[in-house]
Interface confidence: medium
């Protein structure tokens, strides 16, 4: 807390300019009017205030706006945003995408700080849903943003927003998140033709059910092994050798290198060995000839 002291004669600030950097902390407190600061916030960022001086400026704004800063001030916070706590930000009502962009720019190139996470949360809650423009902005600054959301939060993403998602935005998503995103992507891209559809849907396929994988196998998509390895194990297990061969096309040879890893390992265990042998890849571990295969999961479903 800065002590309240009278402003020395002739030092009262008429505007926010470079001369203020030579003011001591108590002089800034005493000589800079908070309302003047609020109206000239856009100048603060251009002036090389020290961290200590920024603390004083923040204190003045906090006193002027105890219930939270107005958006006109928030938009021009610049580096002063780094001084804000999540508690400060929870008082804000940020509705403009331009304000959001301006503040994200301050944190650009770095991991999401608690301040940024709180800011985004406030913004998205204020909008009611994660619309396309917001998602565009957030994933541009934070490619991993989508994957930081819970499945519940992802459920508020409208299918139209999925167009903004790039493959790298899904790199860190887990299966539960892809389970939510995949149906939205399927809906969003439903009017595209086969090859274009596959290009768009590919990075979401970690959430695809068996029937959709079966359908894709009929479309000569030539799925690469990296995508195949990210598929849900439970979705891959029911696929036949012929369906996997069609799904992967020329990439089927890659199964050999992945035979010890899920989902390939588990899928091999479910196939007849003589069916696997038809691939000519030397895959081992299938069900020997003459053995009866009981699908217990099917039996349970029937009973």
């Amino acid at each position: 807390e800065v002590e309240k002291t009278a402003c020395p004669s002739g030092k009262k600030a008429r505007e926010i300019d470079e001369s203020l950097i030579f003011y001591k902390k108590w002089e800034l407190e005493a000589c800079v009017d908070a309302a003047l600061l609020a109206t000239q916030m856009d100048r603060v960022n251009a002036i090389p205030f020290t961290y200590e001086q920024l603390d004083v400026l923040k204190h003045k704004l906090d006193e002027l706006y105890p219930q939270g800063y107005p958006e006109s001030v928030i938009q021009h916070l610049g580096y002063l945003f780094l001084k804000m706590s999540p508690e400060d930000i929870r008082k804000w009502n940020v509705t403009s995408l331009e304000t959001l962009k301006a503040l994200l720019e301050v944190n650009k190139g770095h991991e999401m700080s608690p301040q940024v996470a709180t800011l985004i949360d406030r913004f998205v809650k204020g909008r009611g849903q994660l619309d396309k423009d917001t998602l565009d902005t957030l994933t541009a600054f934070y490619p991993g943003y989508l994957c930081s959301l819970s499945p519940e939060e992802l459920s508020s993403v409208p299918p139209s927003s999925i167009w903004a998602v790039r493959p790298q935005d899904l790199d860190t998503c887990d299966p539960r998140q892809l389970d939510v995103l995949y149906p939205k992507a399927r809906l969003a891209f439903q009017n595209m033709n086969g090859s274009e559809y596959f290009v768009k849907i590919q990075s979401f396929l970690g959430g695809a059910p068996t029937e959709d994988l079966k359908a894709l196998s009929q479309q000569n998509v030539s799925m690469d092994l990296a995508t195949f390895m990210k598929l849900r194990t439970d979705a891959v297990l029911p696929l036949t050798v012929a369906e996997v061969q069609k799904l992967l096309g020329p990439h089927v040879e890659g199964l050999k290198a992945e035979e010890r890893h899920r989902p390939v390992r588990d899928w091999i265990l479910r196939q007849r060995q003589d069916d696997l042998d038809t691939l000519g890849l030397g895959l081992q571990g299938g069900i020997p000839n003459g053995y009866l295969v009981l699908d217990l999961s099917m039996q349970e479903a029937l009973s």
Epitope: F22, A46, Y51, Q53, Y79
Partner: antibody, heavy 124, light 106 residues
């Protein structure tokens, strides 16, 4: 290699002028605040002033404000110090220095790269 | 201006010896910075934010302190450490430097 090389120093008569240059290399000059610092013989280091990346903000130590002019040319990766009305007490080794950039891009409170300096002697 | 007072002004030490110097600020500062200058060379940043080692600086150098009193230490003096060491603050404008501590090898 990150480097700053000053030039333009020399002998000048009292009342005369001189322009020092500082050539930057090995880093994105256009992203950094740059400073001039001087050291008179047998004295300590004295900060002269600084300039922001796009030249929109220039700050001088109050006692030198009307006598020195700092400028930069980002296209040439060069910082300048125009010195006018020189006096004997301006005799010093003049350094250019880069102001460190904080993790978030905000300028820090230290000089992380220095030049070796150029000597200015004011004498009749 | 914040006046920085460094002491001692001069130190003569033997290799392997511990070296300690202090810097006192006329008013409280948040951080201290330390620079090394060898004859006819550019100054070099050693310590930033009071105690953090700048990139490539050997771990025998360290810094500590708070408020107005700060310390710079070389745990085991080496011949190549012979230089003048300056403290610096930038908690308020203008940034100011100490007068320097010259360290020589005995």
């Amino acid at each position: 290699e990150v480097q700053l090389v000053e030039s333009g120093g020399g002998l000048v008569q009292p009342g005369g002028s001189l322009r020092l240059s500082c050539a930057a290399s090995g880093f994105d000059f256009s992203r950094y605040w740059m400073s001039w610092v001087r050291q008179a013989p047998g004295k300590g280091l004295e900060w002269i002033g600084e300039i922001n990346p796009d030249s929109s903000t220039i700050v001088y130590t109050p006692s030198l404000k009307d006598k020195f002019i700092i400028s930069r040319d980002n296209a040439k990766n060069t910082l300048y110090l125009q010195m006018n009305s020189l006096r004997a007490e301006d005799t010093a080794l003049y350094y250019c220095a880069r102001r460190g950039s904080h993790y978030y891009g905000y300028r820090t409170g230290y000089f992380d790269v220095w030049g070796a300096g150029t000597t200015v002697t004011v004498s009749s | 201006d914040v006046v920085m007072t460094q002491s001692p002004a001069f130190l003569s030490v033997t290799p392997g010896e511990k070296v300690t110097m202090t810097c006192s600020a006329s008013s409280s500062v948040s951080y201290m910075y330390w620079h090394q200058q060898k004859p006819d060379q550019a100054p070099k940043l050693l310590i930033y934010d009071t105690s953090n080692l700048a990139s490539g600086v050997p771990v025998r150098f360290s810094g500590s302190g708070s408020g107005t009193d700060f310390t710079f230490t070389i745990s085991r003096m080496e011949a190549e450490d012979a230089a003048t060491y300056y403290c610096q603050q930038w908690s308020s404008y203008p940034p100011t430097f100490g007068g320097g501590t010259k360290v020589e090898i005995k």
